[in-house]
Amino acid sequence: SEVEYRAEVGQNAYLPCFYTPAAPGNLVPVCWGKGACPVFECGNVVLRTDERDVNYWTSRYWLNGDFRKGDVSLTIENVTLADSGIYCCRIQIPGIMNDEKFNLKLVIKPAKVTPAPTRQRDFTAAFPRMLTTRGHGPAETQTLGSLPDINLTQISTLANELRDSRLANDLRDSGATIRIG
């Protein structure tokens, strides 16, 4: 079954996918598509790399990591409910039927509606980066301490969001990183 990732409407969603190049710069083609992985390449392609560079992409879809080091995780900008569904990351390892295929399920939740008392900043406005699922823990923890206008409910909500974002590491931990060569 697919690994599940979550984001809220208006956030940037992060779908992790990694491989280890045989040597630095020795890249393999990778594609991302909407829908489960079909028989060849990707269906409904949203982004594609070749042995050198990103050679096809559509608006709102980009690689935020260093794809030259094998981080081909997909970022989807400003998601809507229509972005929900299965995404295919396909690492096209040379050889006869050597491709590695990953189906990742993206669940988009409606944006949280947080009451905004006079002194409290709107949670989304105060933490735009923390509400993305592509964040990196330490920066978020530091930011948390620098903005005192948050109540305990909001801290709890933030913790849940950070937990969701750390699902990104689950793919690595579950052995889904592919070593080439």
Partner: antibody, heavy 118, light 107 residues
């Protein structure tokens, strides 16, 4: 005009070999997965083989595995199918096709007839 | 291998009729299904991909629907030029397989 043109078909004896070629025009084959599909006389369609953009990944139907080899020369914008150890059941019209959307075939050649008979 | 079963094998209808062909996969293929039209002596032509997407240049009277294992192809108003054999094809995994075809004739 975007098109595919097959050549190389003909009559061959069982156990013989043939090499089919497919010349593409109006688009670059290097931007597409390519494939071969065949149709025996009066029968339905059967997928034969497919190849990735640069030729590093190849896929075959069980019925031809070990006998047929798909290849491409992107500099010549051409796809090939080397057919060895031919059997009478390989008799068919062979179509060169362009793959889209992960596995559907959006562009077909006219086909070339291969007849395996003694 | 995934077996694609088309029905009916032959279909007779009048010009202007609504025509429906079904295709059933022996296991789930998500939406990875295409429909082709083949006229006698000609190469097949892609009409529908991903179960319901209309290929560029194909008349809107052709449509497709379904997902998982059950799929439907419809011609909303049969025209004389639609006389052909229609094939479904899955592309969920290897090997790719086609249905046996449905021959559409005019009454």
């Amino acid at each position: 005009e975007v098109q595919l043109l097959e050549s190389g078909g003909g009559l061959v004896q069982p156990g013989g070999s043939l090499r089919l070629s497919c010349a593409a025009s109006g688009f670059t084959v290097s931007s597409n997965y390519m494939s071969w599909v065949r149709q025996a006389p009066g029968k339905g369609l059967e997928w034969v083989a497919a190849i990735s953009f640069d030729g590093s990944n190849k896929y075959y139907a069980n019925s031809v595995k070990g006998r047929f080899t798909i290849s491409r020369d992107n500099s010549k914008n051409t796809l090939y199918l080397q057919m060895n150890s031919l059997k009478t059941e390989d008799t068919a019209v062979y179509y060169c096709v362009r793959v889209r959307d992960g596995g559907s075939f959006d562009l077909w050649g006219r086909g070339t007839l291969v007849t395996v008979s003694s | 291998d995934i077996v694609m079963t088309q029905s009916p094998s032959t279909l007779s209808a009048s010009v202007g009729d609504r025509v429906t062909i079904t295709c059933r996969a022996s296991e789930s293929i998500s939406s990875w299904l295409a429909w082709y039209q083949q006229k006698p002596g000609k190469a097949p032509k892609l009409l529908i991909y991903t179960a319901s997407s209309l290929q560029s240049g194909v008349p809107s009277r052709f449509s497709g629907s379904g997902s998982g294992t059950d799929f439907t192809f419809t011609i909303s108003s049969l025209q004389p030029e639609d006389i052909a054999t229609y094939y479904c094809q899955h592309y969920a995994n290897l090997p790719l397989t086609f249905g046996q075809g449905t021959k559409v004739e005019i009454k």
